[in-house]
Interface confidence: low
Amino acid sequence: SQVSQNCHNGSYEISVLMMGNSAFAEPLKNLEDAVNEGLEIVRGRLQNAGLNVTVNATFMYSDGLIHNSGDCRSSTCEGLDLLRKISNAQRMGCVLIGPSCTYSTFQMYLDTELSYPMISAGSFGLSCDYKETLTRLMSPARKLMYFLVNFWKTNDLPFKTYSWSTSYVYKNGTETEDCFWYLNALEASVSYFSHELGFKVVLRQDKEFQDILMDHNRKSNVIIMCGGPEFLYKLKGDRAVAEDIVIILVDLFNDQYFEDNVTAPDYMKNVLVLTLSPGNSLLNSSFSRNLSPTKRDFALAYLNGILLFGHMLKIFLENGENITTPKFAHAFRNLTFEGYDGPVTLDDWGDVDSTMVLLYTSVDTKKYKVLLTYDTHVNKTYPVDMSPTFTWKNSKLPNDITGRGPQ
């Protein structure tokens, strides 16, 4: 049946899917607060532009009876059930904000003729790449993959004079939703990362990881894993580590490394942490005050989704264009808008661009220091610390294969 969009005559509605299965275990109340704060800002901006219109959100809740795992495993059907609910109510907003699980987003995109934009805080997996009406406001796996390949190939920095072509990937199946899809992308045999590496092995058992740390016959000195320092400590403990081992710890949505009073524990000295450049350090709004850093990024993505819609609505209204058209549905990409925490850039495929930051532990100060930054928009690395106080010999990152000479 034809679902009418509540999206004209000066009244514009956002459909927000409030799914029990979510990329992050965030109370729905916090997401509601984020959406409402976003709505207030959008109303102010539209009013400021002389556009006298109404913008509201409708929160669509699933019954939670069937799909109650709380994580993303049973999200596929929940997303479709919510769409069915919208269909039965014969009511759809101008835009759909909601599915954060890769499974649900992929299935919803596949099973519906989407003539409206879909904005996601999540949907990290490669299967959600290159979707014409999908916008993702948290860094997807593709962006991580491109950084890693770029960094592996780099060999002209004072602290990295070897290009790398090998890696171990630690993936034990207990990862959070973001980590699951990041590592999944690295594991996939057809992915860009796998294509560019000569050797890559996935370590699935704790013991495999622990053995590699001192194995003289290891095939690579580099191990990629995903999670926070505590996750690494649980796995590695205080075990001895060969001096040319480099652990890359992917921990994108955690800005605790940048806090003034943080000291890096000793077990982090062989580790490079990949995280996102923190949002404006002054951000601590009413909606985010009680959130952990990861959850704040998740709630912030919801809020920015509302601001993105407001940005597009303003443009289309100022140009006198219709909102319920394929043109509007396909417009949420290749642009920069004013997000809550500063400008937000979306690439040609509607995926958020960001500045990734690679940190190391200074052996002098025991503090995390920025080694380099990487701009996902231009796929370019910018060295920051040309004389890092590394734990590695000669303050240079080792070769990825022990005993191999200069490349």
Partner: nanobody
Framework: QVQLVESGGGLVQPGGSLRLSCATS????????MGWYRGAPGKQRELVAR???????NYADSVKGRFTISRDNVKNTMYLQMNSLKPEDTAVYYC?????????WGQGTQVTVSS
Amino acid sequence: QVQLVESGGGLVQPGGSLRLSCATSGIIFHIYTMGWYRGAPGKQRELVARITSGGDTNYADSVKGRFTISRDNVKNTMYLQMNSLKPEDTAVYYCNRFPGATFSWGQGTQVTVSS
């Protein structure tokens, strides 16, 4: 119509104090994070201090311990108490939303610190 009206500036000797006010209208004031900015007209403005809708505050390093930002959500007004003023605090002071400064700028209020 959104309006931001800054007041309270003036000429003061080094070490002196001023209290700036930012009266707003046409916005749902209590929901916004607001900031005090300063700069010469037409030049890049720098953030001096900001206060969230919930009352959390942050300050630029150059004013920490000397300036205090506050707000009255009933009066839709924000304040900046400036103590121990220094010559380098001389500027036009503006209020706006943070981040993004998405409201039209007001006229600002001139603060001059000189002996």
